[in-house]
Structures are given as structure tokens and as C-alpha cells.
């Protein structure tokens, strides 16, 4: 805390400029008017104030705006944003995407800090939903942003926003998140033709049900093994050998290398060994010839 002392004669700041970097902390406190600082916040970023001097400037703004800074000040905080605590940010009402971008720029190239997470949360809650422009901005700065949201939060993403999602944005999503995103993606891309549709939907297929995988198998999509390995096990199990062969196309040979891993392992256990042999890959572990397969889940559903 800086002591309250009178400003020395001739040192009263008329504007926020470079001369202030030579002021001691107590001089900044005494000689810089908080209202002047607020109206000239855009200049602070261009002036190499020390860490301690920035403490004084923040303190002045906090005194001027105890209920939280107005957006006109927030937009020009620049690197002073890095001094803010999540508690400070919770008092803000940020509505402009330009303000959000300006503050994210300061943290660019770094992990999402608690301050940034709070800022984004305030912004998205204020907007009511994750619209396309917001999602575009957030995933540009934080590719993993989408996968940091809960399935409940993802449910507020409108299908139109899915166009902003890049494959790498989904890298860390778990199946529960993809379950929410997949139907939105399906809706968003529904008017595209076969091959273009597959390119767009591919990253979301970890949330696809069996019937959609069966439909894709009829379209010569040549799904790669990496995508296949991310499919829901329960969606893959009912697929026939012929359907998997059509789905993977030339990539079907990759099944051999993955035969011990889910979902391939579990799928093999459900197939007739005769059918697996038709692939010519030496896959083992299928149901021996002559055995009868009872689908107990179907029987339970009927009773």
C-alpha cells in the first residue's frame, strides 16, 4: 500500500507519458489523477512501467472503480490485465468481442490462466451462448478451449458455430463431449456432398452412433485408423466385417496392428472368425465356426 503524500511542485501529471516511468511509487500515487489514467489507459501499454509502478496504477483504478472497471477502460488495459485477479474480473461486464480479443492477445502463446478463464466465462455468460465469432476467437487463441467445456456448457453451442471448429480443437475432447458436438456437426454439415461432408464430420465421429457409421460405410470414405480408433466402442461393435471393410477401404490393413486395442479388440470378439478370415489379415479371436451367437441385449429389450 502506498502512503498518501502530497505531489511535489511541478510534478502533477498532465498526461500519461514516458516521463512517468521516472516517478517513484509514491510520486505516481500522489501525482497521477485516476480519472486521467482511466481516459488515457491506451497509452500505458506503450510505456515501460515497472512491475511495482503497475501496482500503483492498478490501485488507482481500483479506487476509482470499486464496483468494477467500465468496458472503455477494460478494452485498453493491455498488459495491466495480467495484474488482475479472477475476483477483479468477476466484477466486469465485457460485451465486446474486440475487448476480449485485446485481452487474450496479452496472454497469447501461454496456457489459459485463471484470469483468462474467468474473463471468457464472464463474456460467454453475458452473451448467453457460444456464437460463431466468439468460438472462432477463442479457438484461435486456445485450440483446446472447446474440450475444456462440460457437456452441459457445450449444449449451448449453436450448430452454426461448428463451422469455426478445426480438427485440432477437438484433440483433447472426451467421448461425452463428442456425444454433444456430433449431432450439432451433423446438422451443420448436412447440406454438403459425400466427400466434403466426411472431411468436415471426421473430427466429430467419436460421438457418432452405429447407424451413422453404417451409412458412411456405403460412401467410400476410406476412414483412417486414427479416426476409427476414436469411435465409440458401443457404436463399432454392431458393425459387420463387410461394413468395417467398406468404412476403412485401403486402411483396413491397419486393423492388424490395433487388434489388441479397443475398439478393435472388442469388435473382433463379436465377429465370426470365418468373416474375419475373409479380410486376410490374420485377425484372431473371433467366434469359432459352428457357435451360435445370442444377442442377450436384444432379448432383454423384448421381454
Amino acid at each position: 500500500e502506498v502512503e498518501k503524500t502530497a505531489c511535489p511542485s511541478g510534478k502533477k501529471a498532465r498526461e500519461i507519458d514516458e516521463s512517468l516511468i521516472f516517478y517513484k511509487k509514491w510520486e505516481l500515487e500522489a501525482c497521477v489523477d485516476a480519472a486521467l489514467l482511466a481516459t488515457q489507459m491506451d497509452r500505458v501499454n506503450a510505456i515501460p512501467f515497472t512491475y511495482e509502478q503497475l501496482d500503483v496504477l492498478k490501485h488507482k483504478l481500483d479506487e476509482l472503480y470499486p464496483q468494477g472497471y467500465p468496458e472503455s477502460v477494460i478494452q485498453h488495459l493491455g498488459y495491466l490485465f495480467l495484474k488482475m485477479s479472477p475476483e477483479d474480473i468477476r466484477k466486469w461486464n465485457v460485451t465486446s468481442l474486440e475487448t476480449l480479443k485485446a485481452l487474450l492477445e496479452v496472454n497469447k502463446g501461454h496456457e489459459m490462466s485463471p484470469q483468462v478463464a474467468t474473463l471468457i466465462d464472464r463474456f460467454v455468460k453475458g452473451r448467453g451462448q457460444l456464437d460463431k465469432d466468439t468460438l472462432d476467437t477463442l479457438t484461435a487463441f486456445y485450440p483446446g478451449y472447446l474440450c475444456s467445456l462440460s457437456p452441459e456448457e457445450l449444449s449451448s453451442v449453436p450448430p452454426s458455430s461448428i463451422w469455426a471448429v478445426r480438427p485440432q480443437d477437438l484433440d483433447t475432447c472426451d467421448p461425452r463431449q463428442l456425444d454433444v458436438l456430433y449431432p450439432k456437426a451433423r446438422l451443420a454439415f448436412q447440406n454438403m456432398n459425400g466427400s466434403e461432408y466426411f472431411v468436415k464430420i471426421q473430427s466429430f465421429l467419436g460421438g457418432a452412433p452405429t447407424e451413422d457409421l453404417k451409412a458412411l460405410s456405403q460412401q467410400n470414405v476410406s476412414m483412417d485408423l486414427a479416426t476409427f480408433m476414436k469411435l465409440r466402442t458401443d457404436a463399432v461393435l454392431p458393425l459387420t466385417v463387410a461394413e468395417v471393410q467398406k468404412l476403412l477401404g485401403p486402411h483396413v490393413e491397419g486393423l492388424k496392428a490395433e487388434e489388441r486395442h479397443r475398439p478393435v479388440r472388442d469388435w473382433i470378439l463379436r465377429q465370426r472368425q470365418d468373416d474375419l478370415d475373409t479380410l486376410g489379415l490374420g485377425l484372431q479371436g473371433g467366434i469359432p465356426n459352428g457357435y451360435l451367437v445370442l444377442d442377450l441385449s436384444m432379448q432383454e429389450a423384448l421381454s
Epitope: 514516458e18 515501460p48 515497472t50 512491475y51 503497475l54 498488459y79 495480467l82 495484474k83 496479452v106 496472454n107 497469447k108 502463446g109 501461454h110
Partner: nanobody
């Protein structure tokens, strides 16, 4: 980690010159500004000169026209050329740099003693 090592200090007569150097290493981020501070015995540390990433320089009134700050990016070295030295320039001189992207952090060297005396 970031290391700033000053050199070039020493004893000099009034009116003489010295050139301080500061070798920086371990910098893996964009630097916002480099500077020189000094601290005389029993006094607070004061900013002497600063140079921004864009090359803009600023000087304390007491050294304007006598001191020149510069840097050599290829050698990762900061300099302070001090001419027309006075007794009141006697102090420990510290090299300093600012990080302002991703985190706010100021880095300081250990200091080099400059004594101006006849």
C-alpha cells in the same frame, strides 16, 4: 532461466567515462524493455535510462546528454555509455529487463559498482 550479468564498473575521476555492459542469457520470450537503474548508498533504486523493444530511449533528467543506452541484439548485450561523470553518479548500477507477454515480470542483474572520485 534468465540471467543478467553486468560488467564495466569501477573507479573513475570526475569528468571521466565508463561503459557498462550487461550480458543477457536464458531469454525465451519477447522483451518489452531493457533499462539501467542505480542505487546510491542509503537511497532508493532509481531509473537511469530505458530502451523499449522498438528502440525508443528515455533518460532521467539528471543524466540527459551525458549517458547513452543502447543494445546489440546479435550479442544479447545492453550497454550504458557514461560520459562527463560526476560524484553524484556514484552508485551500484543494475541492468533490468521487462517481460510483458503471458506474464508480468521484471528481471534484475546483481549490479556493478561505479565510483566517481578524485
Amino acid at each position: 532461466q534468465v540471467q543478467l550479468v553486468e560488467s564495466g564498473g569501477g573507479l573513475v575521476q570526475p569528468g571521466g567515462s565508463l561503459r557498462l555492459s550487461c550480458a543477457a542469457s536464458g531469454i525465451t520470450f519477447p522483451v518489452n524493455a531493457y533499462g539501467w537503474y542505480r542505487q546510491a548508498p542509503g537511497k532508493q533504486r532509481d531509473l537511469v535510462a530505458i530502451i523499449s523493444a522498438g528502440g525508443t530511449t528515455n533518460y532521467a533528467d539528471s543524466v540527459k546528454g551525458r549517458f547513452t543506452i543502447s543494445r546489440d541484439n546479435s550479442k544479447n548485450t545492453l550497454y550504458l555509455q557514461m560520459n562527463s561523470l560526476r560524484a553524484e553518479d556514484t552508485a551500484v548500477y543494475y541492468c533490468y529487463l521487462q517481460r510483458r507477454i503471458g506474464m508480468l515480470r521484471d528481471y534484475w542483474g546483481q549490479g556493478t559498482q561505479v565510483t566517481v572520485s578524485s
